[in-house]
């Protein structure tokens, strides 16, 4: 048939290599489109069919797999680089075809160069480390399938240019990293360098991660409130505007969503009539605890609103909790001739 | 970045009184607490008080209550400790200092100070 | 109102040794899961900085040469190794319940 299903350009999965190193990529459609895997279409009668767009072309052109060394081949579902070369860079198709069904889809690949200390537009992937939480571990990523598991390669880490050796509280353990107590000063890039033979050629594969360490769960607490408190009273006149805040600290929690919301009479501010504004802001400590500010503000408070019960309210994986402000109405200063005489006696 | 940044140097008269100010930037100026730190040449740190801005809620120091006032303009975001009835020993430097938030529900510091602004009382 | 005594009132210690300044509190200064004990660094003609708080919680951008230890009413500052930059005058500091702030009176830290 001529008609194809086309999943378009997948940019979700915008692939980055390193120039002159190994690549496989494997074809997205058994990954994420279609509910069968390689062998089951295979054993179907389908064929895999690999071409691509050169960066700044709109000309479709088909893989050259007849390339000296076989730099470039396929393998059942996967595209082989051995080794990638800057021009490789393009939008790549994989389509499964026989007389009656046909699917494709494309994807970005980028072929990245890096200097010396490893540094390059490459997308890091982020390994977050709790502090001072005992033994962890980092292990050299995407690194399955370049080599049989009788192949032994060789494994250097690096802390930005450095190599890690003797370091105090970092320890390489081949595919390995140790962090035996994680500090602040651990955070940063660290790379592995994958050294391994093939057909008597010799390949090097680069992965840079960062390691963020963050806060640790055992110190991890509830959400809280530091205002509204108990020590502050928002005293207003009709007519003035009333600005509260709700500031609300949380501690990090892996995948825990935050949450900071006023209630009004009970009520969130958008199912009542009030002319209510909020505002949020967001700031992190290093180790990625959050502080979370929301300003509700009324621009001419009315002696009603100085009556109502205005609630801040938290949530986290750890605990929800709720804050009341003391709002009241500024009692004004008596007048003279008329409050005070009167209380003096006068007539 | 948080700054805070202090009015300057003033002379003043026995039982006269002095305004100084301290403007914050950098930060959500109205939700952390003021306070207000003063140090005679040669002493130690001495607390006064502190406000905070979104409410003008203030707190003295006992040996300076009826003599401080303290007051915020939030549209400047700058925060004024007014100090009333000069005598010599009031000769001192004055730090503005913001309270930081933290994982626990009380019991703050002191994360970022002004530069000091120096208070001279002599006849 | 609690009162800091700090000790000692100055201290002359060698580059690369260990100084250790002690604070003790009137009363205890602790609560469940915190104390309210921070310590500061000040220089000559500089405003006071914040090095740790909550008696042992380093303020960021501070070196790990500083630590802090102790609860209840007994609370020590540590540099380890002691260097130059380090010449100044240590205060601890508690805010122990809102609106009373106190100082200690300070410990001036000097190179032999």
């Known amino acids: 048939s001529e008609r194809c299903d086309d999943w378009g350009l997948d940019t979700m999965r915008q692939i980055q290599v390193f120039e002159d190193e190994p690549a496989r990529i494997k074809c997205p459609l058994f990954e994420h489109f279609l509910k069968f895997n390689y062998s089951t279409a295979h054993s179907a009668g389908l064929t895999l069919i690999w071409y691509w767009t050169r960066q700044d072309r709109d000309l479709e052109e088909p893989i050259n797999f007849r390339l000296p060394e076989n730099r470039i081949s396929k393998e059942k579902d996967v595209l082989w680089f051995r080794p990638t070369l800057l021009n490789d860079t393009g939008n790549y198709t994989c389509m499964l075809r026989n007389t009656t069904y046909c699917s494709k889809v494309a994807f970005p690949l980028e072929v990245v160069q890096k200097d010396s200390c490893f540094n390059s537009p490459m997308k890091l992937p982020v390994h977050k480390l709790y502090i001072e939480y005992g033994i962890q571990r980092i292990t050299c990523p995407n690194v399955d399938g370049y080599f049989p598991s009788s192949v032994k390669p060789t494994i250097t880490w690096y802390m930005g240019c450095y190599k890690i050796q003797n370091f105090n509280n970092v320890i390489p353990e081949g595919m390995n990293l140790s962090f035996l107590i994680a500090l602040i000063s651990n955070n940063g890039n660290y790379t592995c360098v994958v050294t391994y033979p093939e057909n008597g050629r010799t390949f090097h594969l680069t992965r840079t991660l960062t390691v963020k360490v963050v806060g640790s769960p055992k110190n991890a607490v509830p959400p809280v409130i530091h205002s509204p408190n108990d020590h502050v009273v928002y005293e207003k006149e009709p007519g003035e505007e009333l600005l509260i805040p709700c500031t609300v600290y949380f501690s990090f929690l892996m995948d825990s969503r935050n949450e900071v919301w006023w209630t009004i009479d009970g009520k969130k501010p958008d199912d009542i009539t009030i002319d209510v504004t909020i505002n949020e802001s967001i700031s992190h400590s290093r180790t990625e605890d959050e502080t979370r500010t929301q300003i509700l503000s009324i621009k001419k408070v009315t002696s009603e609103d100085l009556k109502r019960s205005y609630v801040c309210h938290a949530r986290s994986a750890k605990g929800e909790v709720a804050k009341a402000a003391k709002v009241k109405q500024k009692v004004p200063a008596p007048r003279y001739t008329v409050e005070l005489a009167c209380g003096f006696g006068a007539t | 970045q948080v700054q805070l940044v202090q009015s300057g140097a003033e002379v003043k008269k026995p039982g006269a009184s002095v305004k100084v100010s301290c403007k914050a930037s950098g930060y959500i100026f109205i939700t952390y607490w003021m306070n207000w730190v003063r140090q005679a040449p040669g002493q130690g740190l001495e607390w006064v008080g502190q406000?905070?801005?979104?409410?003008?809620?203030?707190y003295y120091a006992q040996k300076f209550q009826g003599r401080v006032t303290m007051t915020v303009d939030t549209s400047t975001s700058t925060v004024y400790m007014e100090l009333s009835s000069l005598r010599s020993e009031d000769t001192a430097v004055y730090y503005c200092a913001r309270t930081d938030f933290y994982r626990y529900d009380g019991g703050y510091a002191l994360d970022y100070w002004g530069q000091g602004t120096l208070v001279t009382v002599s006849s | 109102d609690i009162v800091l005594t700090q000790s000692p009132i100055s201290l002359a210690v060698f580059l690369g040794q260990r100084a250790t300044i002690s604070c003790r509190a009137s009363q205890s200064v602790s609560t469940s899961g915190y104390s309210s004990m921070h310590w500061y660094q000040q220089k000559a003609g500089q405003p006071p900085k914040l090095l740790i708080k909550?008696?042992?919680d380093l303020e960021s951008g501070v070196p790990v040469r500083f630590s802090g230890s102790g609860s209840g009413t007994d609370f020590i500052l540590n540099i380890h190794p002691v260097e130059v930059e380090d010449i100044a005058t240590y205060y601890c500091?508690?805010?122990?319940?809102?609106?009373?702030?106190?100082f200690g009176g300070g410990t001036k830290l000097e190179i032999k």
């Open positions: 909550y008696a042992s």
């Open positions: 500091h508690h805010s122990w319940g809102i609106p009373m702030y106190t």
């Open positions: 406000i905070f801005p979104a409410s003008g809620t203030t």
